[in-house]
Interface confidence: low
């Protein structure tokens, strides 16, 4: 009974991570936050990057790291697959570099399983991205 209580998943309370295909998580997350409020604060720092539109998978990827999927059947959080991480990094790292910043070490793609299988469960990205998205906000590389 105690174990089941410990494993129970919690509803995702972070607005930007709701309606992404799963609705429960379990903390700590994949970067060590114990509280969803702490995770949300760190997530907000990526909002401009999401608005910029460098990758359609960025929001899903970040949420899978900061509020990983939880299932009652498995006692570990399910984060992103390495392939999704690499796809997002390939598109968004150049944008960060425009502003003089490197890809965060906390999002190092080698930390995530290369693919979803029985040994290492992870979430694949929601569809592939052959066509880059248009910029959605006034933030442009030329501003700097």
């Amino acid at each position: 009974f105690g174990d089941e209580e410990e494993r129970r998943c919690d509803p995702i309370r972070i607005s930007m991570c709701q309606n992404l295909g799963y609705n429960v998580t379990k903390m700590p997350n994949l970067v060590g936050h114990e509280l969803q409020t702490d995770a949300e604060l760190q997530l907000t720092t990526f909002t401009p990057l999401i608005q910029y539109g460098c990758s359609s998978q960025l929001q899903f990827f970040l949420c899978s790291v900061y509020v990983p999927m939880c299932t009652e059947k498995i006692n570990i959080p399910i984060g992103p697959c390495g392939g999704m991480c690499l796809s997002v990094k390939r598109r968004c790292e150049p944008v960060l570099k425009e502003f003089g910043f490197a890809w965060p070490e906390s999002l190092n793609c080698s930390k995530f399983p290369p693919q979803n299988d029985h040994n290492h469960m992870c979430m694949e990205g929601p569809g592939d991205e052959e066509v880059p998205l248009p910029h959605k906000t006034p933030i442009q590389p030329g501003e700097e």
């Epitope: 970067v31 907000t44 720092t45 909002t47 960060l96 502003f99 965060p104």
Partner: antibody
Framework: EVQLVESGGGLVQPGGSLRLSCAAS????????MHWVRQAPGKGLEWVAT????????YYADSVKGRFTISADTSKNTAYLQMNSLRAEDTAVYYC?????????????WGQGTLVTVSS | DIQMTQSPSSLSASVGDRVTITCRAS??????VAWYQQKPGKAPKLLIY???SLYSGVPSRFSGSRSGTDFTLTISSLQPEDFATYYC?????????FGQGTKVEIK
């Protein structure tokens, strides 16, 4: 070119109020963390407050909580620091700085600072 | 609150010297540490972020490293324009703290 220009500093008596402004240009401040950092004469840097206009998030150092209010007017691309119940120890140069998202938001651009003197 | 204890508070060095400044965090701050340079009467300038990443436009003689809760700024070969005060800074979500500063003076 990215620029931050502070204004509103001056001499004020203890218990008085002052409102500082930080006018941003060259970028959309809505999507950045905007900080106020102060430096007392001959002393080090002290973080005061932060606003994230996009989500209306505000954060304060314990030393100013309840006395100072940080805000932003996105239509004017300007951040503000309303300082009430001022004390002698609030005397400092007040800098406004911005932080880009991700990578732990370090402060990559700073204004030139505005001097606040609290004295009777 | 997380405290950043910076040492030394001042040091004297000559052009060409290797200079090392350390900040110790009172608790784990991941890699959320930046380093700034400040000259008298001027605003601080960002040198290093995320503990070890060199900010664009900053000379490569500046570097940062981390070992546990100890963060280090190194200037490999001090130049005349490097005489200034240096500050470390940590951002732990909603709280930001700076080290006390290290003044690098000419010997």
């Amino acid at each position: 070119e990215v620029q931050l220009v502070e204004s509103g500093g001056g001499l004020v008596q203890p218990g008085g109020s002052l409102r500082l402004s930080c006018a941003a240009s060259g970028f959309n401040s809505s999507f950045y963390f905007m900080h106020w950092v102060r430096q007392a004469p001959g002393k080090g840097l002290e973080w005061v407050a932060t606003v994230y206009p996009y989500l209306d998030y505000t954060y304060y150092a314990d030393s100013v909580k309840g006395r100072f209010t940080i805000s932003a007017d996105t239509s004017k691309n300007t951040a503000y620091l309303q300082m009430n119940s001022l004390r002698a120890e609030d005397t400092a140069v007040y800098y406004c700085a911005r932080a880009f998202p991700g990578s732990y938001h370090p402060m990559d651009y700073w204004g030139q600072g505005t001097l606040v003197t609290v004295s009777s | 609150d997380i405290q950043m204890t910076q040492s030394p508070s001042s040091l004297s060095a000559s052009v060409g010297d290797r200079v090392t400044i350390t900040c110790r965090a009172s608790q784990s701050v991941s890699s959320a540490v930046a380093w700034y340079q400040q000259k008298p009467g001027k605003a601080p300038k960002l040198l290093i972020y995320s503990a070890s990443s060199l900010y664009s436009g900053v000379p490569s003689r500046f570097s940062g490293s981390r070992s546990g809760t100890d963060f280090t700024l190194t200037i490999s070969s001090l130049q005349p324009e490097d005489f200034a005060t240096y500050y470390c800074q940590q951002s732990s979500y909603s709280l930001i703290t700076f080290g006390q500063g290290t003044k690098v003076e000419i010997k």
